[in-house]
């Protein structure tokens, strides 16, 4: 699987999950989240050659098409597969609230 | 929806489904499919700005990150959303067989 266990410990050039830290204030311009100040969101990056964690029959066909037509703009793309929630603390007036923001952290990627 | 109805009749720059015809022999090197000789597979292409058919909370956050950090390599990607099957005819010996190849035709796209 193209997950954090494999991707963070390798120098994989192809589609893999990459490290990305997002600072809520600096990177998003958000002040409303009290805690955490930022989080390891990660992102997916890398080419999707034939036989590389291809998502569907279509992505397999497109990867094969791309092998035969390397200059073509039609190619599978490396996107999130498994996502995890992020617990946050924010304020409503003076009252702190704890919430889970769903689908916030990328754990693995796929070629779609 | 970023589907064929909208995308094929517009000059949309952002993520949309685009026309692509794949010839089984020429483009894939496949001789095993007897009919059809090729098909309109289509593909997804175009940037994914904030407020553009974003798939998850993560893709929205990443699009916002990208608006503030336009040079970053972390950005949502335009990928298939709705896929349709393709009926084909192939031979087993001298006997023709009809089969549905699932997830072969892109009908709409999303930013993931």
């Amino acid at each position: 699987a193209l997950d954090t266990n494999y991707c963070f410990s390798s120098t994989e050039k192809n589609c893999c999950v990459r490290q990305l830290y997002i600072d809520f204030r600096k990177d998003l311009g958000w002040k409303w989240i009290h805690e955490p100040k930022g989080y390891h969101a990660n992102f997916c990056l890398g080419p999707c050659p034939y036989i590389w964690s291809l998502d569907t029959q279509y992505s397999k066909v497109l990867a094969l098409y791309n092998q035969h037509n390397p200059g073509a703009s039609a190619a599978p793309c490396c996107v999130p597969q498994a996502l995890e929630p992020l617990p946050i603390v924010y304020y409503v007036g003076r009252k702190p609230k704890v919430e889970q923001l769903s689908n916030m952290i990328v754990r693995s990627c796929k070629c779609s | 929806a970023l589907d064929t109805n909208y995308c094929f009749s517009s000059t949309e720059k952002n993520c949309c489904v685009r026309q692509l015809y794949i010839d089984f022999r020429k483009d894939l090197g496949w001789k095993w499919i007897h009919e059809p000789k090729g098909y309109h597979a289509n593909f997804c292409l175009g940037p994914c700005p904030y407020i553009w058919s974003l798939d998850t909370q993560y893709s929205k956050v990443l699009a916002l990150y990208n608006q503030h950090n336009p040079g970053a390599s972390a950005a949502p990607c335009c990928v298939p959303q709705a896929l349709e099957p393709l009926p084909i005819v192939y031979y087993v010996g001298r006997k023709p067989k009809v089969e549905q190849l699932s997830n072969m035709i892109v009908r709409s796209c999303k930013c993931s």
């Epitope: 998003l28 311009g29 958000w30 | 407020i51 909370q57 929205k60």
Partner: nanobody, 118 residues
């Protein structure tokens, strides 16, 4: 339930100016990410400009240097100052608010028509 009401649209000559306003009610306005989106005939809605609760703004390339987005959390309003308007800016302009909790949701106003023509 968040409600958004736009105002300030109208007919203007090329090179002219307009100021769009959006008033919000029914939510903690101070935490939402606000944006202006527009839809020209036969086109999808596109992002024009956005502004976060921390006053960070971003613009689509075609309006950079001409449009300015701002917000006032105490008055629960957002505005878009549009200068040097071009015929291609003709569209229905929508106010959009994204609230991120408890689950992400986009709220849209009804829209205000902007027509740039001589």
């Amino acid at each position: 339930q968040l409600q958004l009401v736009e105002s300030g649209g109208g007919l203007v000559q090329p090179g002219g100016s307009l100021r769009l306003s959006c008033a919000g009610s029914g939510i903690a306005f101070s935490r939402v990410t606000m944006a202006w989106s527009r839809q020209a005939p036969g086109k999808q809605r596109e992002l024009v400009a956005l502004i976060t609760d921390g006053n960070r703004s971003a613009y689509v390339d075609s309006v950079k240097g001409r449009f300015t987005i701002s917000r006032d959390n105490t008055k629960k309003t957002m505005s878009l100052q549009m200068n040097d308007l071009k015929p291609e800016d003709t569209a229905v302009y929508y106010c959009v608010a994204t609230d991120w909790v408890p689950t992400r949701r986009d709220y849209w106003g009804q829209g205000t028509q902007v027509t740039v023509s001589s």
